[in-house]
């Protein structure tokens, strides 16, 4: 356990031309504060990703009025420290976000009106009990110096502050679950790390790396109740205290999600989706109102509807989650029609559309056939965005500029013979057949079988396709 | 004891404009949002917004947008909506409340739009 | 935005009978409703929020019900003064929205 702390020097317009004059805008005069976020890691953490070592809100500043032909000054600021406390182990490695945040307090409609006027990104090793480290950040046209540091509380040592020590003075005995340190301090150092993953509720360990569990529990990770590790119809590692086999161990097994949390699983991990008045890697935080500033991402902070939640966040569009943490994945709505591959770029969706397709949603099938129609009387079929052209009789070919033989592909029946003809073919009939194309035939009492011959023309006789 | 206290009747002619008031009283007025509903004669309800006095955040139903306005005086512990634009479809009762647990109303506010 | 279907629009029901009145939300709203009774010429009144939980002083014949997107109001043994319009509340999400209300009469 410990707290990062963190002391804001000044803030004010960075050297160079083109800097501001004053963080206020026209309407009048403003004050500033600031907005601290620790993440683990030195990765490049998606911005929307939470703040799961903790954020906290500094106080106000006092109120900043600009004075007109003054050169522009350092900011004033708030006083004392933004300190941001931690339960577990100080991770050494994190990402500290400062956002510096303008009040303004003009005649806005609604109140105070926020906005973010700076906002900067370090990625840093810092070991928890070493000195202030001081930086200096651009951010656009403004300059952030600021100092910070990581220490240890409640009895904790160590560069992590995973050592639990007692000062010299206390009995040297040490409490349960506590083992003496070297002999040359009167300390006590935490007890052995248990194997990972092991259930902090209900099990325990007397060598690194084991796992044991209390009575009513089992499982390699002590996570599954003993009532339920009955030998029917379970799969997966044997249990050395039972003899059953138990399920193997998942990210979300005896739920890591406090509070009502509902976890799911990730690749290697785990996520818990937090109900409303509750944050955190493991919606351990709660308590928090807006003056924790616990919307993410410009989410508008407002009171909550239940005794349980003190404060409702407002996401703005892209955002979701009970702190705006969680980018919406829009794509997963298959906004895209025809085929079209979703591109999520974070201020806006696009659809890559595919050929033949067009519009913001690929929703419009383009027409091949427009300005270029098809020859000799065809008409133009529009299908998957490709051109088509369907041929008057004797004319093919992709724009139907080709002439075709009409009868090349036999099409009288029954012997018929076919001869072209200026719209089309014609089929003259063996004797005894009848029909456009000689289908049918003729019965020897001269009447003909269904359908009819047209009035006027006898069996025989040569018959058009029209 | 929490009780809300809203204006009168107003009757205004179309495409007027008309702000409501309701006076809070019995509670922290920071503490909690303020909503405004709409119910209509004879009609159901209709969330119109809220605003959180504690910072002046404010949610809008995208069908008032440009309808409604909140606002909040904290010194007077007192939320307005003014209205814009009347016509006759916006005659109805306007209640401000607190729609949290308790749920608290006020008497409501009669608007009539007429010529 | 999410939209409240309730039924029945209206009950005719004799007294001490059991009455239950039905919302349906358009997705799942985890829970955050709240039903309201409302009698001629009056406020609204709460009775229910989070689904099930009763406000203080409201009698407990009323109770809510429901998970997912299907709640429920029931009034275990209707009395004369529970005569009114009932209506749900959904505040999962903004636009907070209220089913069309139920008309309840005695036979």
């Known amino acids: 356990a410990g707290v990062f702390e963190l002391q804001i020097h000044s803030f004010g317009p960075g050297p160079g031309p083109g800097a501001p004059r004053s963080p206020c805008s026209a309407r009048g005069p403003c004050r500033l504060f600031f907005r601290v976020c620790l993440k683990p890691g030195l990765s490049e953490e998606a911005a929307e990703s939470p703040c799961a070592l903790g954020a906290a809100l500094s106080a106000r500043g006092p109120v900043y009025t600009e004075q007109p032909e003054a050169p522009a000054p350092d900011l004033p600021l708030p006083n004392g420290l933004l300190q941001v406390p931690f339960r577990d182990a100080w991770p050494g490695t994190f990402s500290l976000i400062i956002e510096t945040w303008r009040e303004e307090l003009g005649d806005q409609i609604g109140g105070p009106a926020w906005s973010l006027l700076a906002r900067v990104t370090r990625r840093r090793r810092l070991a928890a009990g070493g000195p202030w480290a001081r930086d200096i950040q651009r951010a656009g046209a403004w300059e952030l110096r600021f100092s910070y540091r990581a220490r240890c509380e409640l009895l904790a040592v160590g560069t992590a502050c995973t050592r639990l020590c007692r000062p010299r003075s206390a009995p040297s005995r040490c409490g349960p679950g506590l083992r003496p340190c070297a002999p040359l301090e009167d300390e006590c150092e935490a007890p052995p790390v248990c194997r990972a993953g092991c259930s902090l509720e209900h099990g325990f360990c007397e060598q690194p790396g084991e796992c044991r569990c209390l009575e009513g529990w089992t499982g390699p990770l002590c996570t599954v109740p003993a009532s339920t590790s009955s030998c029917l119809g379970l799969r997966g590692p044997s249990s050395a205290t039972t003899g059953c086999l138990v399920p193997g161990p998942g990210p979300c097994d005896g739920n890591p999600c406090a509070n009502g949390g509902s976890c799911s699983e990730t690749p290697g991990s785990f996520e818990c989706t937090c109900p409303r008045g509750f944050y955190g890697l493991r919606c351990e935080v709660s308590g928090v109102t807006c003056a924790d500033g616990p919307c993410f991402n410009g989410g508008l902070c407002v009171g909550g509807a239940d005794p349980d939640s003190a404060y409702i966040c407002h996401c703005p569009p892209g955002f979701q989650g009970s702190n705006c943490e969680k980018r919406v994945d829009r794509c997963s709505l298959q906004p895209c029609r025809n085929g079209g591959l979703c591109l999520d770029l974070g201020h806006a969706l696009r659809c890559r559309c595919r050929a033949g397709f067009a519009g913001p949603r690929c929703e419009h099938n383009l027409d091949d056939c427009a300005g270029r129609a098809c020859a000799n009387g065809g008409t133009c079929v529009e299908g998957g965005g490709a051109h088509r052209c369907s041929c008057a009789l004797g004319f093919g070919g992709r724009d139907c500029r080709e002439r075709a033989d009409p009868c090349a592909a036999r099409p009288c029946a029954h012997g018929g013979r076919c001869y072209a003809h200026f719209s089309g073919l014609v089929c003259a009939c063996a004797p005894g057949y009848m029909g456009s194309r000689c289908e049918f035939p003729v019965h020897p009492d001269g009447v003909s079988a269904l359908p009819a011959a047209p009035p006027g023309l006898r069996p025989g006789d040569p018959q058009r396709y029209l | 004891e929490v009780q809300f206290q809203q204006s009168g009747p107003e009757l205004v002619k179309p495409g007027a404009s008309v702000k409501i008031s309701c006076k809070a009283s019995g509670y922290t007025f920071t503490d909690y949002n303020i909503h405004w509903v709409r119910q209509s004669q004879g009609k159901s309800l209709e969330w119109i917004g809220l605003?959180?006095?504690?910072?002046?955040?404010?949610v809008y139903n995208q069908k008032f947008k440009s309808k409604a306005t909140l606002t909040v005086d904290n010194s007077s512990t007192s939320a307005y909506m003014e209205l814009r634009s009347l016509s006759s479809e916006d005659s109805a009762v306007y209640f401000c409340?607190?729609?949290?647990?308790?749920?608290?109303w006020g008497q409501g506010s009669t608007l009539i739009v007429s010529s | 935005d999410i939209k409240m279907t309730q039924s029945p629009s209206s009950i005719y029901a004799f007294l001490g009978e059991r009455v239950t009145i039905t919302c349906k939300a358009s997705?799942?709203?985890?829970?955050?409703l709240s039903w309201f009774q409302q009698k001629p010429g009056k406020s609204p009144k709460t009775l229910i929020y989070r689904a099930n939980r009763l406000v203080g002083g409201v009698p407990s014949r009323f109770s809510g019900s429901g998970s997912g997107q299907d709640y429920s109001l029931t009034i275990s043994s209707l009395e004369y003064e529970d005569v009114g319009d009932y209506y749900c509340?959904?505040?999962?999400?903004?636009?907070?929205?209220f089913g069309g209300g139920t008309k309840l009469e005695i036979k």
């Open positions: 997705q799942d709203i985890n829970s955050y």
């Open positions: 409340a607190r729609l949290n647990w308790e749920g608290y």
């Open positions: 605003i959180y006095p504690f910072n002046g955040g404010i």
């Open positions: 509340l959904q505040y999962a999400e903004f636009p907070y929205t």
